[in-house]
């Protein structure tokens, strides 16, 4: 058993039929010694008396809010949550496996630049009695500070018969060094509590590996005289790190016909313009990637050819 | 050229070669996303590699103030990785494919280090750790880790030279 936060405790249980469970001793937080009784949740049934209460925790029916009283007055509370371990593996019932970029990916994170700011998100089908707490650090043995905000519900989607909820959190490395080569990964830890079930999820990454620039901005076409060719121009996204002579991007320009089956013409360039042939009913799209490190491409910015 | 006395390197040449190094490092080990190397333990094997750290002056302002600190750090790293790529980690079993970019990568590391430090000048270089994995699978894992680490190193070096070529060239 360990303390998650003040008056909230997590009991770690091996979860299998007829498991013996864990013996837990609760202590009433009071100077009083006599006349103390214990109850669980809303029940008025007295579970025991005295300053301490010993219980055998085997299942969710044994978890909940234990309260010690004296003469009708509440003295203190202890909330017990369960963390299940099945076949040596901690349960992951609360969050959905996003399966990208690999199986058992529960947390996904992205950064728009090298400033030390990143966003992580996760999915669940649970809609109520759900809380998340996020902690992060750079490295684990001698951790350096990363500040995370509150996790917020960022999207709701219908998936078949189920509703899916996306939560996200923003974090910022306290003393980020955008130009340095990272040697210690960022660690992100999410505590998830659904009713009386506790689970924790972790992710470890370098900012450089989760970089995904915003799409190029101000995408424009300039027809060239007496030609089917056009000059496409664009700018670096506002949110990309500066100066651009140091934090450079490379770009992919694509000409795509109306039909998905039509051949796509692609040009790669380090410049912020390119000359391409604009076909009727086609569109021109541009996306960006770090020039020197192959992290994710941005989403496409597009304009119609006409 | 960046000599210990403090004259300027051939920024544009260094920029071109460092960008080529980035391309080679990724073509030598493209499938990085499919293997989370941090989960493979064995941290001590790559802990000793030289990293370009916050105080090394490789940020835009540090380069403007005095690029020598940064260039010396990059030079140390290039020599270190050049030695690693020439060691039995890469020359031993399992053999690299004949058209593997590792050979080109090795030569380009040497080329860039020589651009930074011509014959007759000596910056102190970092000792290469004695890594001699006994099993072929250990060697393979170590190659992945070294190449992964090299990708991050040459990305920073390429940014430095690109910025230098754009803002510090005479």
């Amino acid at each position: 058993i360990w303390e998650l936060k003040k008056d909230v405790y997590v009991v770690e249980l091996d979860w299998y039929p007829d498991a013996p469970g864990e013996m837990v001793v609760l202590t009433c937080d009071t100077p009083e010694e006599d006349g103390i009784t214990w109850t669980l949740d809303q029940s008025s049934e007295v579970l025991g008396s005295g300053k301490t209460l010993t219980i055998q925790v085997k299942e969710f029916g044994d978890a909940g809010q234990y309260t010690c009283h004296k003469g009708g007055e509440v003295l203190s509370h202890s909330l017990l949550l369960l963390h299940k371990k099945e076949d040596g593996i901690w349960s992951t019932d609360i969050l959905k496996d996003q399966k990208e970029p690999k199986n058992k990916t529960f947390l996904r994170c992205e950064a728009k630049n090298y400033s030390g700011r990143f966003t992580c998100w996760w999915l669940t089908t649970i809609s109520t009695d759900l809380t998340f707490s996020v902690k992060s650090s750079r490295g684990s043995s001698d951790p350096q500070g990363v500040t995370c905000g509150a996790a917020t519900l960022s999207a709701e989607r219908v998936r078949g018969d189920n509703k899916e909820y996306e939560y996200s959190v923003e974090c910022q490395e306290d003393s980020a060094c955008p130009a340095a080569e990272e040697s210690l990964p960022i660690e992100v830890m999410v505590d998830a509590v659904h009713k009386l079930k506790y689970e924790n999820y972790t992710s470890s990454f370098f900012i450089r590996d989760i970089i995904k620039p915003d799409p190029p901005k101000n995408l424009q076409l300039k027809p060239l005289k007496n030609s089917r060719q056009v000059e496409v121009s664009w700018e670096y996204p506002d949110t990309w790190s500066t100066p651009h002579s140091y934090f450079s991007l490379t770009f992919c320009v694509q000409v795509q016909g109306k039909s998905k089956r039509e051949k796509k013409d692609r040009v790669f360039t380090d410049k912020t313009s390119a000359t391409v042939i604009c076909r009727k009913n086609a569109s021109i799209s541009v996306r960006a990637q770090d020039r020197y490190y192959s992290s994710s491409w941005s989403e496409w910015a597009s304009v119609p050819c006409s | 050229r960046a000599v210990p006395g403090g004259s300027s390197p051939a920024w544009t040449q260094c920029q071109q070669l460092s960008q080529k190094l980035c391309t080679l490092a990724w073509s030598a080990h493209p499938l990085v996303g499919h293997m989370d190397l941090r989960e493979e333990g064995d941290e001590e094997t790559t802990n000793d590699v030289p990293h370009i750290q916050c105080g090394d002056g490789c940020d835009p302002q540090g380069l403007r103030d005095n690029s020598q600190f940064c260039l010396q750090r990059i030079h140390q790293g290039l020599i270190f990785y050049e030695k690693l790529l020439g060691s039995d980690i890469f020359t031993g079993e399992p053999s690299l494919l004949p058209d593997s970019p590792v050979g080109q990568l090795h030569a380009s590391l040497l080329g860039l280090s020589q651009l930074l430090q011509p014959e007759g000048h000596h910056w102190e270089t970092q000792q290469i750790p004695s890594l001699s994995p006994s099993q072929p699978w250990q060697r393979l894992l170590l190659r992945f880790k070294i190449l992964r680490s090299l990708q991050a190193f040459v990305a920073v070096a390429a940014r430095v030279f690109a910025h230098g070529a754009a803002t510090l060239s005479p």
Partner: antibody, heavy 120, light 107 residues
Framework: EVQLLESGGGLVQPGGSLRLSCAAS????????MSWVRQAPGKGLEWVSS????????KYADSVKGRFTISRDNSKNTLYLQMNSLRAEDTAVYYC?????????????WGQGTLVTVSS | DIQMTQSPSSLSASVGDRVTITCRSS??????LGWYQQKPGKAPKLLIY???NLQGGVPSRFSGSGSGTDFTLTISGLQPEDFATYYC?????????FGPGTKVDVK
Amino acid sequence: EVQLLESGGGLVQPGGSLRLSCAASGFTFSGYDMSWVRQAPGKGLEWVSSIWSSGGYTKYADSVKGRFTISRDNSKNTLYLQMNSLRAEDTAVYYCARQGVGGSGSLLYWGQGTLVTVSS
Amino acid sequence: DIQMTQSPSSLSASVGDRVTITCRSSQGVRYDLGWYQQKPGKAPKLLIYGAFNLQGGVPSRFSGSGSGTDFTLTISGLQPEDFATYYCLQDFQYPFTFGPGTKVDVK
């Protein structure tokens, strides 16, 4: 073109409340941290509060902590400052500002400001 | 909290002069410092961010330098439109703090 337009200022008695709004246009509002800065008549600039792009993290100057609340509605491209328990020393022009390049804290773009006067 | 000091608090100069304003922080803020210009009745305007980066559209006669605790704003040839109050701001950590300002007026 980036535009920030503050509103909601005015005369209020000590102990009263006001809610300032800042309507943003010309950029993707949900992608940027935002701040409020104030300037008392004839005095220098004082940072008041900041909010991250998602709204999930907020920070306040000690002088307003517990009395002011910063919030944002990304669907309406609007930043808010709820000011309670106002004091005479809160009298100032309040500016909203968009934070800057590559996630930096630089206050890159500013509105023209709205005047809050706390007086009986 | 990080305290910011600026010197001088005011200065008189003529068009064409080279003007230097310094800003000092009570603890290191790396390069996380900006310089702002404010004219009476107007909102402040960012001139320099990240200690030395010139904000787009700002004339090149403005330049910034320094790191850690000591920073400088230089106006290489003062123009009539440059008479204003200048503030530095550290955005290294919350709470962000401004310097008290330097008023540049006509000699």
